[in-house]
């Protein structure tokens, strides 16, 4: 394993780690955010950062309700310096092979390089090549959206079905949902699960004459995707007189594997490529985002890329003290490793962002769910938070109870857009939504002590049940509006937060060996399900389950 990017094995070896341990013991664990606000009238001013996007729109990141003070922030920044986060960041942006276990560059940032500055991987300036694919996406999406691209009977395309899984599904699903306001010409559907129900239910609502299938698979060998793709192809052929020449107008591939695409029967002119330096969970910026471009239009897709590019510029050019994603990542490390927090809640106060937590779940947990460092040793500290979330205010009526009064510390990010795309009832809904956004963060911070509970009339044994400890940390993210540029910026923010965490933990955030073992065993078991014999080759539990399944199937 190539570990030329970091010169330490474990984060616990770094002097700033020990320093933070001492600070945590002496002041961190007893720090009261409420008191910090009383002590420092400029706390909000100091601890909120405003990001200005390429189009002039703004996003405010308020870190002031976190369990930090000036000394803690300074020590965290010292940790970032000692871990050489900026060195690893710069190596990533230079196209170096920072994915050491797979010996690959990590270059999703090159996909949103709309300034078209030279960006090199292995001596190749990939900027013109990225631009070439985007030009293809632009031309194709405009042809389909305008009706110039027609199905085999001459009808225009009305529905797009994206067949993919993981990174080839989650990103496009989340983005098309988040930017639904910008759609209108086409309907998009997403099929990911190998469960036949997913493809069957989708095929019920589309017409073969007017449907375009996008087969999204980096390798074009992903079992779930290719099985679903073959089912779609068989369905299409059965409805269209079994004429394979019709496939060209109704199937496109988003892949790196031209040979497999051709074997499947898709014209390679309808293949939209990307490179091995694009990880699945970072691929929505690539040809994998074609469903997004088709749905919201290419110009909006480009604005989405530019929003991310603006965060990339901020991340690479801003001093550490004001570097928004870096601070977000440092706070995560602070809670994870010093407070023992194991989770990270992301609650968007925005129905359009209802899939955002699921998307971030893959981004964060597949990236940082690792226990071996770049130095090839097991960590002696916690990594990878369990990220979860649901849109608020729904979340307030489910798991917020535990966030407010449970036994676990759950650092939380709340996200709100000041301007709604649907300001109905004279903005009544938006004002109610916003009031909850502000109130929840305030409530988690200030809590409610025994005195207040009693003053409100509670007595006896009921009193402790109504007490809120408060001092529960939140980061409030307030955007002006959820536009393509804003969404691009928010995703890139979390990408670089994830990067910062991984750099400090000294883990490779860009491989995913953990997904392999289950896949291998599933292949073995798949063969066993094809015959009627009783299975005894596994442990008693697995054997028992397989045999019961076979009996009931």
């Amino acid at each position: 394993s190539n570990n030329s990017f970091t010169n330490f094995k474990l984060a616990t070896e770094l002097p700033a780690w020990s320093k933070l341990q001492k600070i945590y013991e002496s002041q961190g664990k007893t720090l009261s955010v409420k008191q910090e606000f009383q002590k420092d009238a400029k706390r909000f001013e100091k601890l909120n950062k405003t990001f200005t996007n390429y189009d002039g729109s703004k996003i405010l990141f308020d870190y002031s309700k976190n369990l930090v003070n000036d000394e803690i922030i300074a020590a965290l920044i010292e940790l970032a310096k000692e871990a050489n986060v900026t060195g690893l960041r710069d190596a990533m942006f230079k196209g170096e092979h920072i994915n050491s276990t797979e010996d690959r560059a990590v270059y999703h940032v090159a996909l949103r390089n709309r300034a078209n500055k030279p960006m090199y991987v292995d001596g190749v300036n990939v900027a013109p090549e990225v631009d070439s694919v985007l030009k293809h996406m632009k031309e194709f999406s405009e042809q389909v959206r305008s009706g110039e691209w027609k199905g085999y009977t001459g009808k225009k395309i009305t529905d797009v079905v994206n067949i993919g899984i993981g990174g080839s599904d989650l990103g496009p699903v989340m983005v098309t949902e988040a930017l639904k306001h910008y759609a209108g010409v086409l309907d998009v559907h997403f099929v990911s699960n190998i469960d036949g129900t997913h493809i069957a239910e989708t095929l019920k609502v589309v017409d073969p004459e007017t449907t375009l299938f996008l087969i999204a698979s980096k390798t074009f060998t992903t079992a779930e995707t290719i099985t679903n793709a073959n089912t779609a192809k068989n369905w299409f052929l059965s409805k269209t007189g079994n004429d394979p020449s019709h496939i060209a107008k109704h199937f496109a591939a988003l892949s790196t594997n031209e040979t497999e695409v051709a074997k499947f029967g898709i014209d390679t002119k309808n293949m939209f490529g990307f490179e091995s330096w694009v990880g699945g969970r970072y691929s929505v910026w690539s040809a994998i985002g074609l469903s997004v471009a088709l749905y919201i239009g290419y110009d909006n897709f480009e604005a989405f890329l530019k929003g991310a590019e603006a965060v990339d510029n901020h991340f690479t050019q801003t001093p550490l003290e004001d570097n928004i994603p870096l601070l977000g990542g440092l706070l995560s490390v602070w809670y994870n490793n010093f407070f023992g927090a194991q989770t990270h809640l992301v609650a968007p106060f925005d129905q359009y962002l209802h899939r955002f937590p699921a998307y971030l779940q893959q981004l964060s947990m597949e990236s940082n769910g690792k226990s071996v460092t770049r130095g090839n040793v097991f960590t002696d500290y916690s990594t990878g938070s369990i990220l979860f979330g649901e849109p608020a205010t729904n979340a307030q009526h489910s798991f917020f109870q535990l966030v407010h009064q449970g036994t676990k510390l759950i650092p939380s990010d709340f996200i709100l857009a000041a301007q709604s795309h649907n300001p109905i009832e004279n903005k009544l809904h938006q004002k109610m939504l916003a009031s909850n956004f502000f109130a929840q963060a305030e409530a988690l911070m200030v809590g409610k002590d025994e005195e207040q509970v009693k003053a409100e009339g509670a007595t006896g044994g009921l009193v402790p049940h109504k007490v809120f400890s408060g001092n529960r940390p939140t980061t409030s993210i307030l955007a002006q509006k959820i536009t393509p540029a804003t969404l691009g910026a928010l995703i890139a923010y979390y990408e670089h937060v994830t990067f910062t965490e991984g750099a400090i933990w000294n883990i490779n955030s860009f491989d995913q060996w953990g997904v392999e073992l289950g896949k291998v065993l599933a292949k073995v078991i798949g063969k066993e399900l094809d015959n009627s014999s009783t299975i005894s080759t596994h442990d008693a539990s697995t054997n028992g389950l397989i045999n019961q399944f076979k009996e009931w199937m």
Partner: nanobody, 119 residues
């Protein structure tokens, strides 16, 4: 800096063979459809043969079918044109052409190599 460098041209007798090579640098070679074009004196440049990025499909101009074979070695960033049963009318400057995904949005030309078929 993108470069396509052809080699292998020369003088050959009718019925003879030549193997042209074109080595690319500064590109993600396996993503480029590669072609050979030729231009005879006083004539238009014409397409001779094309191969897709992974080599999964090839196409030939009618007059060279069965005589010429295009192939590629992506590990060496090189495309070849094996020319057999050469005829005087094959005399031309042969150019290597790289087209990103074969879509025409990003393409590069080599300098050309002279092939002369004469007795």
């Amino acid at each position: 800096q993108v470069q396509l460098v052809e080699s292998g041209g020369g003088l050959v007798q009718p019925g003879g063979s030549l193997r042209l090579s074109c080595t690319a640098s500064g590109v993600t070679f396996s993503r480029y459809a590669m072609s050979w074009y030729r231009q005879a004196p006083g004539k238009e440049r014409e397409l001779v043969a094309t191969i897709t990025g992974a080599g999964s499909s090839t196409n030939y101009e009618d007059s060279v079918k069965g005589r010429f074979t295009i192939s590629r070695d992506n590990a060496k960033n090189t495309v070849y044109l094996q020319m057999n049963s050469l005829k005087p009318e094959d005399t031309a400057v042969y150019y290597c052409y790289a087209d990103h995904y074969g879509l025409g949005y990003l393409d590069y030309w080599g300098q050309g190599t002279q092939v002369t078929v004469s007795s």
